[in-house]
Interface confidence: medium
C-alpha cells in the first residue's frame, strides 16, 4: 500500500544489447516520479535515476562492472513534489525487476562484415570486432574480449545468381572459404553463443555482395 | 601429425572408480574442446560431453550429468573421463574425440582409438 | 533433444554401386550436420561436417546433402573398403545427438 497518489511501476523489463542495459517499465507517470535500484544478489543497493519522469533507466555502468553476477532492480514511486512522502507502511510503493545476468542474457547485437578479400577460389571474410561498454583497465572491450570461446559467428554465403545457401562457423572473427572462380557471392553474418539457453542468436547482419566497394579481389 | 592416443582397456568390477585418459599431440591441446563418446557393445554412438582444456569449461549430456566427470590437465595435454562407482551398464567402448574448429558447437574431426571398459563382477 | 532418424538401418550393396543414406533431424538443425564411417572394432572417421563439407583426406566419392530436417549420404561408386556403418550427427543445439547408424553390407 502507499498514498492514495502514487501507483506501483509494472511491467519492469531489461532491454540489453551488447551490454548497453536499460530498464524499462510503466506507467508513464502522472503526478508521481521514480527512482531505480540496482543489486547483485549479495551486495548493496544503489540509487539511479533519482526522481525521474522517464519510464527507463540505463543501467549499463553499473552492470558492466561484473557481467557475470546476477542483477536486481527495483523502481520507487514519489508523488510528484513530495518526494519525501512515503506509503502507509512508511516506505514508497516499490516493484522489483526479474533478475538478469548480463552474460547469458545480453541480446547479441546486429553484428557487420568488416570486409571481405577474394584471393583465387577462396573467400576470406572478416566480422567487425564490435566494441562493448564493458571495461578492463580503462579500455572497452570488444564483444571477442568479453565471450571469449562461447560466442561464434555463422556465415551464411551463396552464388549472386542463385539462392541456394552454404554456411560456415568460425570462432574467431575471419571465415576462409571456398568459392567458384568468376561468381560473384553474397554474405551475411550472425553472432552466435551456442551455450546459451536464451537469446542464442543475434539477427543477421546486413548482406554484402562481391563487387561492392567493401571487398577486395585478388587473383592469383 | 594431430592425434589423440587412449589409454587401455579396463576391467572392473561394480563400485570401483576408474578414471580414463586421451592424450593430444600435434595441435594446439588448450584451444580445442575434447569430446567423450559412449558406444555401448553392439550400439550406437551417444555423445556424453566435452571440455576446454584452456580453462576447464565443461558441458555434459543431460543424459550423462552426474555419472561422468570430464577434466583435463592441460600440462601434459590430457583429458580425463572418470566414475566414483561403476555400474555393469557402464560397460561399453569410450571414445576421445576432437572438435574440428575448437569450438564447443562443432562437428568432430579426429578420434582416439577407443578404451574398453568392462565392468563384471 | 534432437532425434535423428537413419534410414534404412542396413542395406546390400555391391562394388560400384551407388549408395544413398538418409537422416532427418526432429527439428530444423541448418547444415549443421556431420557423417561418420564406423568399421568394425575401429574407431569412428570422421567424412563431411557442415552437411556438405568434405573432410580432408577423404575421397571425392563421398558427398553430403541436405538442410533443415532431411540429409543425404552418397557414395557415388562403392569400394570394398566402403562397407561399414554409417552414422549422421546434428550439432545444431545441445546435447549433440547422433543417429541409429546404417549399416552397408556386401551383396
Known amino acids: 500500500s502507499g498514498t492514495t497518489n502514487t501507483v506501483a511501476a509494472y511491467n519492469l523489463t531489461w532491454k540489453s544489447t551488447n551490454f548497453k542495459t536499460i530498464l524499462e517499465w510503466e506507467p508513464k507517470p502522472v503526478n508521481q516520479v521514480y527512482t531505480v535500484q540496482i543489486s547483485t544478489k549479495s551486495g548493496d543497493w544503489k540509487s539511479k535515476c533519482f526522481y525521474t519522469t522517464d519510464t527507463e533507466c540505463d543501467l549499463t555502468d553499473e552492470i558492466v562492472k561484473d557481467v557475470k553476477q546476477t542483477y536486481l532492480a527495483r523502481v520507487f514511486s514519489y508523488p510528484a513534489g513530495n518526494v519525501e512522502s512515503t506509503g502507509s507502511a512508511g516506505e514508497p510503493l516499490y516493484e522489483n525487476s526479474p533478475e538478469f545476468t548480463p552474460y547469458l542474457e545480453t541480446n547479441l547485437g546486429q553484428p557487420t562484415i568488416q570486409s571481405f578479400e577474394q584471393v583465387g577460389t577462396k573467400v576470406n571474410v572478416t566480422v567487425e570486432d564490435e566494441r562493448t561498454l564493458v571495461r578492463r583497465n580503462n579500455t572497452f572491450l570488444s564483444l571477442r574480449d568479453v565471450f571469449g570461446k562461447d560466442l561464434i559467428y555463422t556465415l551464411y554465403y551463396w552464388k549472386s545468381s542463385s539462392s541456394g545457401k552454404k554456411t560456415a562457423k568460425t570462432n574467431t572473427n575471419e571465415f576462409l572459404i571456398d568459392v567458384d572462380k568468376g561468381e560473384n557471392y553474397c554474405f551475411s553474418v550472425q553472432a552466435v553463443i551456442p551455450s546459451r539457453t536464451v537469446n542464442r542468436k543475434s539477427t543477421d547482419s546486413p548482406v554484402e555482395c562481391m563487387g561492392q566497394e567493401k571487398g577486395e579481389f585478388r587473383e592469383i | 601429425e594431430v592425434q589423440l592416443v587412449q589409454s587401455g582397456a579396463e576391467v572392473k568390477k561394480p563400485g570401483e572408480s576408474l578414471k580414463i585418459s586421451c592424450k593430444g599431440s600435434?595441435?594446439?591441446?588448450?584451444?580445442?574442446?575434447i569430446g567423450w563418446v559412449r558406444q555401448m557393445p553392439g550400439k550406437g554412438l551417444e555423445w556424453m560431453g566435452i571440455i576446454y582444456p584452456g580453462d576447464s569449461d565443461t558441458r555434459y549430456s543431460p543424459s550423462f550429468q552426474g555419472q561422468v566427470t570430464i577434466s583435463a590437465d592441460k600440462s601434459i595435454s590430457t583429458a580425463y573421463l572418470q566414475w566414483s562407482s561403476l555400474k555393469a551398464s557402464d560397460t561399453a567402448m569410450y571414445y576421445c574425440?576432437?572438435?574440428?574448429?575448437?569450438?564447443?558447437?562443432?562437428?568432430?574431426?579426429?578420434w582416439g582409438q577407443g578404451t574398453m571398459v568392462t565392468v563384471s563382477s | 533433444d534432437i532425434q535423428m532418424t537413419q534410414s534404412p538401418s542396413s542395406l546390400s550393396a555391391s562394388v560400384g554401386d551407388r549408395v544413398t543414406i538418409t537422416c532427418r533431424a526432429s527439428?530444423?538443425?541448418?547444415?549443421?550436420l556431420a557423417w561418420y564411417q564406423q568399421k568394425p572394432e575401429k574407431a569412428p572417421k570422421s567424412l563431411i561436417y557442415a552437411a556438405s563439407s568434405l573432410q580432408s583426406g577423404v575421397p571425392s566419392r563421398f558427398s553430403g546433402s541436405g538442410s533443415g530436417t532431411d540429409f543425404t549420404l552418397t557414395i557415388s561408386s562403392l569400394q570394398p573398403e566402403d562397407f561399414a556403418t554409417y552414422y549422421c550427427?546434428?550439432?545444431?543445439?545441445?546435447?549433440?545427438?547422433f543417429g541409429q547408424g546404417t549399416t552397408v553390407e556386401v551383396k
Open positions: 550427427q546434428q550439432y545444431n543445439s545441445y546435447p549433440p545427438t
Open positions: 574425440a576432437r572438435h574440428k574448429l575448437g569450438m564447443d558447437h562443432d562437428a568432430f574431426d579426429i
Open positions: 600435434g595441435y594446439s591441446f588448450t584451444s580445442c574442446w
Open positions: 527439428q530444423g538443425i541448418s547444415s549443421w
